[in-house]
């Protein structure tokens, strides 16, 4: 006899990185017929939703109108059909950004390099933080973590045309509270003649997670679709 139901899926819309005082929706998708969904935050009950009618709904949305550092952390959800509860979902890391200060991102030897050259990014923030995060635009988001008292180095090693793209960095005050994003730095990598065509910067992931994050920052608009960033989510664990 089955003791628990399959775990639901959890994600954040429009993004798991939420500028402070902006809105975010945490979505939990379980099964049709679920009479109750519970959202848990750092091990405590955060919110409850009872779909109506349950047989026609398999997803609920928990709306957070005003993101702040108290709500940044790990979320999971469960659902109930009759008296039977599901397994908990995977953990969703919700990050609050635009805290305190803005770091400076620079690149050495410069933003235009030849394939095979060694490139290092430097993220600098003069306030009290020792952890830095470097993100490349695009859904894959290639997040790297670095450490330093006021500056972190991010050596990319010998670069290829796959490293082309726009980079930003954050200072991290803890795993779930990040600074404002730095100004973008666009890395241009030139290689063999056949590789220098105007190919997309991240052809595997044409949908732009960063664009959605910026949309949240600039207008507070919601996009009604799930955007996942497993790389960044796993980095936070």
């Amino acid at each position: 006899q089955q003791q628990t139901l399959p775990k639901p899926f959890i994600w954040a819309e429009p993004h798991f990185m939420v500028p402070k005082e902006k809105q975010v929706t945490i979505c939990c998708q379980g099964n049709y017929g679920a009479v109750e969904y519970q959202l848990h935050f750092e091990g405590s009950l955060f919110a409850v939703d009872r779909p109506k009618p349950p047989e026609r709904i398999n997803k609920v949305k928990f709306y957070i109108p005003d993101m702040n550092s108290r709500m940044a952390g790990q979320y999971s959800c469960i659902y109930r059909v009759g008296e039977l509860w599901s397994e908990p979902s995977n953990l969703l890391d919700l990050v609050v950004t635009e805290m305190y200060d803005t770091p400076t991102l620079s690149v050495h030897p410069g933003p235009e390099v030849i394939s095979g050259e060694k490139v290092t990014f430097y993220c600098r923030l003069d306030t009290a933080t020792s952890m830095f995060l470097l993100l490349k635009e695009g859904r894959s988001s290639h997040v790297q973590r670095g450490y330093g008292k006021v500056q972190a180095e991010f050596p990319l090693g010998p670069v290829t045309t796959a490293h082309r793209g726009t980079y930003r960095c954050f200072g991290s005050y803890n795993n779930h509270a990040w600074s404002f994003p730095s100004e973008p730095v666009k890395l241009l990598v030139t290689g063999d003649i056949e590789n220098t065509s105007l190919a997309p910067e991240d052809p595997t992931f044409p949908a732009d997670t960063w664009g959605t994050y910026l949309l949240t920052t600039e207008t507070g608009l919601q996009k009604d679709h799930a955007l996942w960033d497993h790389t960044a989510q796993n980095l936070l664990r």
């Epitope: 955060f46 409850v48 928990f62 109108p65 709500m71």
Partner: nanobody, 126 residues
């Protein structure tokens, strides 16, 4: 900007009843999820009861069957009817709101609430 003003607190004997009211200013009340929290002397603030914008309710185990939360959107007011009061119910009771919200969500965690009242004192003693 939303302002919340609680009333109805006072002193009552064990087993007695009280009804707390929370009046909200502004036209956003119908789109707000509301909750009651309490803080006893020397203790942390704790969840008591909450109601969604569509009237779904949720209660702390310690008050289930004794307290009832309700709302009147026409009066921009949320109520907490308290009966069978016990000494351990003595606390300052705070009304809180999540504005705006959508659907049936009932918020239980204090971090979710973005507006708070100043509180009203309830004392239960013989």
């Amino acid at each position: 900007e939303v302002q919340l003003v609680e009333s109805g607190g006072g002193e009552v004997q064990p087993g007695g009843s009280l009804r707390l009211s929370c009046a909200a200013s502004g036209r956003t009340f119908a789109s707000a999820a509301m909750g009651w929290f309490r803080q006893a002397p020397g203790k942390e603030r704790e969840f008591v009861a909450a109601i969604s914008r569509s009237d779904d309710t949720y209660y702390a185990e310690s008050v289930k069957g004794r307290f009832t939360i309700s709302r009147d959107n026409a009066k921009n007011t949320v109520y907490l009817q308290m009966s069978s009061l016990r000494a351990e119910d003595t606390a300052v009771y705070y009304c809180a709101a999540v504005v705006p919200t959508y659907g049936n969500t009932i918020y239980v965690h204090s971090a979710a609430y973005n507006y708070w009242g100043q509180g009203t004192l309830v004392t239960v003693k013989p």
